[in-house]
């Protein structure tokens, strides 16, 4: 996160760290807890690393440097990448992770509410992006979970900023015209959440951007509302019943 500040314990209890353990262990992506056994993240996090057993998912964590060999983590039972995601295209950058064992909810580890299907009418004015990603383009993973308040921008505005790309309906963009605040490398897959009527909802999944926090280059996020049917279908067919945290 560029231009952000330290988060507090329990402030973003749905935020998880997706880490890969090969020879060493490192944080690669963020994710959002959306049910006892489900994490929503970006499909591109698994490019070249589709093997379930190399991944470790840490929830209820604020400081990555607190993680030791004794810190409990979740393992992956199943990775469900959106069927239309292609490595050569930025579209449909969404994936579900089914955990091997359900997580208990605590003050520091609980799910984020999902938006209503095809939610286009809600005007979100209080949106935040969180993650342990770089604090500048040529930076490094941060220890303490960072947060930054960023306004949504229209898809028309976003398309103007990215004339050489296709900003699809299933994407949402956020950023300041002057830059300075944005997600960055290592924040991918993490949440863009907005508070509306006193409730936090998962509006976007950190996907891509041109560099980080550049002027007139907003961050691009996967628009979760456009994938509600897919999320429900995949979680129900796997579970027999939905265990999602939907808005009341």
């Amino acid at each position: 996160i560029v231009g952000g500040t330290n988060s507090s314990w329990g402030e973003w209890p749905w935020q998880v760290s997706l880490q890969v353990k090969l020879t060493a262990q490192r944080h690669l992506c963020g994710g959002s807890l959306i049910g006892h056994q489900w994490v929503l993240t970006a499909a591109h996090c698994f490019d070249g690393l589709p093997l379930q057993d190399v991944w470790r998912i840490y929830s209820g964590i604020l400081n990555l440097s607190d993680i030791t060999k004794d810190t409990p983590f979740s393992q992956i039972k199943e990775i469900i990448i959106h069927q239309n995601y292609k490595v050569s295209e930025g579209n449909h950058d969404i994936a579900l992770i089914k955990l091997q064992a359900p997580l208990n909810y605590t003050e520091f580890q609980k799910p984020i509410c999902l938006p209503s299907k095809g939610d286009t009418s809600t005007i979100y004015t209080n949106c935040w992006v969180t993650g342990w990603g770089f604090s500048k383009e040529k930076g490094e993973i941060q220890n303490i979970l960072q947060k930054v308040n960023i306004p949504l921008v229209t898809n028309e505005e976003c398309q103007k900023a990215y004339a050489d790309a296709k900003i699809a309906q299933a994407m949402v963009c956020a950023g300041y015209k002057e830059g300075g605040k944005d997600a960055c490398k290592g924040d991918s897959g993490g949440p863009l959440v907005c508070k509306h009527n006193g409730m936090w909802r998962l509006v976007g999944i950190t996907s891509w951007g041109e560099g980080c926090a550049r002027r007139e280059q907003p961050g691009v996020y996967t628009k979760v509302a456009e994938y509600m049917d897919w999320i429900l279908e995949k979680t129900q067919s796997s579970d027999g019943k939905a265990q999602m945290q939907s808005p009341a």
């Epitope: 050569s88 295209e89 930025g90 950058d93 398309q159 960055c184 991918s188 891509w208």
Partner: antibody
């Protein structure tokens, strides 16, 4: 399966015009940036031009600027290259290519993911 | 414009040997925008590596890419008969997009 099929090449006199076409299939054409690359006989590859998915944004190499025009018809899944004021040095095999723009570490990648078989343009009197 | 310089111009090796091809850029290139292509006589180029180090779909793991900044490398760990071809590096970090002049890998 992604397929790109160029056509329209041939022999043309210096100062003449030619319009190349590239018919695309097997992918969502309107989502992809498209490009033309050429290769003079026995030489290396030279990028010519690209066009954004919507067709609203185009960029050209200095060597063809003002003479060549790239365009696309997303309803026909076809890419075009209108070549005017042709010169002997424009003689080459012209390839159209689909530009992959994936995501890696929250940044985009960009590369020529699929290529057509090429069409030969010969400019000679 | 960003100039890409490939070396050597020609590499004469035997099947089974290791090939190391270099690509130097005149300015910094974000590695996400550096690709390698293979071209055989009479054929269109084929994508091998994108993002400096990611193998394209269907490319055997004997091909690997590495490097960052201004210095990039394509390595073929054990040359197979079908690997003898011309290899190009290419950047799309900044327009005009540019290619290296190519390295020909020929049978010794």
């Amino acid at each position: 399966e992604v397929q790109l099929l160029e056509s329209g090449g041939g022999l043309v006199q210096p100062g003449g015009s030619l319009r190349l076409s590239c018919a695309a299939s097997g992918f969502t054409f309107s989502h992809y940036l498209m490009t033309w690359v050429r290769q003079a006989p026995g030489k290396g590859l030279e990028w010519v031009s690209y066009i954004s998915p919507s067709g609203g944004h185009t960029i050209y190499a200095d060597s063809v600027k003002g003479r060549f025009t790239i365009s696309r018809d997303n309803s026909k899944n076809t890419l075009y290259l209108q070549m005017n004021s042709l010169r002997a040095e424009d003689t080459a095999v012209y390839y159209c290519a689909m530009v992959g723009q994936g995501i890696r570490g929250r940044s985009r990648t960009s590369y020529f993911a699929q290529w057509g078989q090429g069409t030969l343009v010969t400019v000679s009197s | 414009e960003i100039v890409l310089t490939q070396s050597p111009g020609t590499l004469s090796l035997s099947p089974g040997e290791r090939a190391t091809l270099s690509c130097r850029t005149s300015q910094f290139v974000n590695s996400n925008y550096l690709a390698w292509y293979q071209q055989k006589p009479g054929q269109a180029p084929r994508l091998l590596i994108y993002g400096a180090s990611s193998r394209a779909t269907g490319i055997p793991d004997r091909f690997s890419g590495s490097g960052s900044g201004t210095d990039f490398t394509l390595t073929i760990s054990r040359l197979e008969p079908e690997d003898f071809a011309v290899y190009y590096c290419q950047q799309s970090s900044r327009t005009p997009w540019t290619f290296g002049q190519g390295t020909k890998v020929e049978i010794k």
